[in-house]
C-alpha cells in the first residue's frame, strides 16, 4: 500500500539511449545522433520505382510497441527493426523488404534485437 502523499505515477525515464539517425533526425540532433527514452530503429521502404530506401532514427517509448511491429501498408513494402541494448545499436540492424504477397504483406512479428 502506498503511504499517504506518496506519488503513484512512475517517474519519467531519462533520455538515455543514443541512436544513429538518417532522414529522421530531429532538429536538436548533432552529428546524425538522436537521443530517446525508447528505441533505436532502422527501416527499409520501397519507393515508387521499386528501389529500397534505408533510414534510421529514434522512437519514443510511447507508441514504440506498434512502431516496432511491422504494420502492413497498401501496395508498397516497408519493414522496421528496433533495438535498445546499447547506444547506436541500430547501426547493426539490417531489415529486409518483406516478400510481395496479395498486394500487401503478411503480419510480421515485433522486431526487437
Amino acid at each position: 500500500k502506498k503511504e499517504d502523499g506518496e506519488s503513484t505515477a512512475p517517474t519519467p525515464r531519462p533520455k538515455v539511449l543514443r541512436c544513429k539517425c538518417h532522414h529522421h533526425c530531429p532538429e536538436d540532433s548533432v552529428n546524425n545522433i538522436c537521443s530517446t527514452d525508447g528505441y533505436c530503429f532502422t527501416m527499409i521502404e520501397e519507393d515508387d520505382s521499386g528501389l529500397p530506401v534505408v533510414t534510421s532514427g529514434c522512437l519514443g517509448l510511447e507508441g514504440s510497441d506498434f512502431q516496432c511491429r511491422d504494420t502492413p501498408i497498401p501496395h508498397q513494402r516497408r519493414s522496421i527493426e528496433c533495438c535498445t541494448e546499447r547506444n547506436e545499436c541500430n547501426k547493426d540492424l539490417h531489415p529486409t523488404l518483406p516478400p510481395l504477397k496479395n498486394r500487401d504483406f503478411v503480419d510480421g512479428p515485433i522486431h526487437h534485437r
Epitope: 529522421h24 519507393d47 508498397q76
Partner: antibody
C-alpha cells in the same frame, strides 16, 4: 506526448482563400505524414490530402486538387492547408491528423493523432 | 472512389449491452480498415487500425474483424463513455474515404 495545435476560427467571403495552420510537437516532425480531413456541420468526414514534412511530397483528393495547397515549415514544425475559391459548401471544421507510422517514402493510411479542429465559415 | 457504407446509421443501447456496427466497402480493401470514435465538438480518435489492431490506450472491450469488403466493430460491454459516433475509413486506395457514421445513443 504528441500534440497538434491548429489556428483559430475563420470567417471568409465566397471566392476568398483560407490558410489553416497545424503546429506539431512531442515527436520528430519530419518523420510522419500529416493528413487533412474536413467535416461539414452535422456531416461525416472527408479526406482532403496529405503532406510529408521531410520531402514536402503531397497527395491530394481529386475533389480538391485544383483548390488545395498543403505546405510545411520544418523550422517551426508547422503544416499549412490553403483552400481557395471558397464557396458556402466549404463551411466545415478542418482537422490535421498525424499518421500512425514512421515513413520516409511509403504512403500510410492511419490517422492516429488529431488537432482540435478549425472552423471555417464561408458566408457572404 | 471507394464507397464505405455503415449500418445502422444510429442505434440505441444500454450500458452493458454488446454493440455491433458494420461497414461495407464497395470493393475489396484487404484489411485496410480503420475505426474512429467522435464525440460532439471533439476531434475523432483512432480506435482500431488494420481491421483489428487496438490503438494505444483503447480499452479491450473494443474489437474489430472482417476482410475484403465486410467489417465489424464490436463493443463487448457498452460503457457510459462509449456513447458517441463511430466512423470506418478505408486505407487501401487513394483517396481515403469514410463511412457515413453510426451514432450510438443511450436507450
Amino acid at each position: 506526448q504528441v500534440q497538434l495545435v491548429q489556428s483559430g476560427a475563420e470567417v471568409k467571403k465566397p471566392g476568398a482563400s483560407v490558410k489553416v495552420s497545424c503546429k506539431a510537437s512531442g515527436y520528430t516532425f519530419i518523420s510522419y505524414w500529416m493528413h487533412w480531413v474536413r467535416q461539414a456541420p452535422g456531416q461525416g468526414l472527408e479526406w482532403m490530402g496529405m503532406i510529408h514534412p521531410n520531402s514536402g511530397s503531397t497527395n491530394y483528393n481529386e475533389n480538391f486538387k485544383s483548390r488545395v495547397t498543403m505546405t510545411r515549415d520544418t523550422s517551426t514544425s508547422t503544416v499549412y492547408m490553403e483552400l481557395s475559391s471558397l464557396r458556402s459548401e466549404d463551411t466545415a471544421v478542418y482537422y490535421c491528423a498525424r499518421d500512425l507510422l514512421i515513413a520516409t517514402v511509403v504512403v500510410t493510411p492511419y490517422f492516429a493523432y488529431w488537432g482540435q479542429g478549425t472552423l471555417v465559415t464561408v458566408s457572404s | 472512389d471507394i464507397q464505405m457504407t455503415q449500418s445502422p446509421s444510429s442505434l440505441s443501447a444500454s450500458v452493458g449491452d454488446r454493440v455491433t456496427i458494420t461497414c461495407r466497402a464497395s470493393q475489396d480493401i484487404s484489411n485496410f480498415l480503420n475505426w474512429y470514435q467522435q464525440k460532439p465538438g471533439k476531434a475523432p480518435k483512432l480506435l482500431i487500425y488494420y481491421t483489428s489492431r487496438l490503438h494505444s490506450g483503447v480499452p479491450s472491450r473494443f474489437s474489430g474483424s472482417g476482410s475484403g469488403t465486410d467489417f465489424t466493430l464490436t463493443i463487448s460491454s457498452l460503457q457510459p463513455e462509449d456513447f458517441a459516433t463511430y466512423y470506418c475509413q478505408q486505407g487501401n486506395t487513394l483517396p481515403y474515404t469514410f463511412g457515413g457514421g453510426t451514432k450510438v445513443e443511450i436507450k
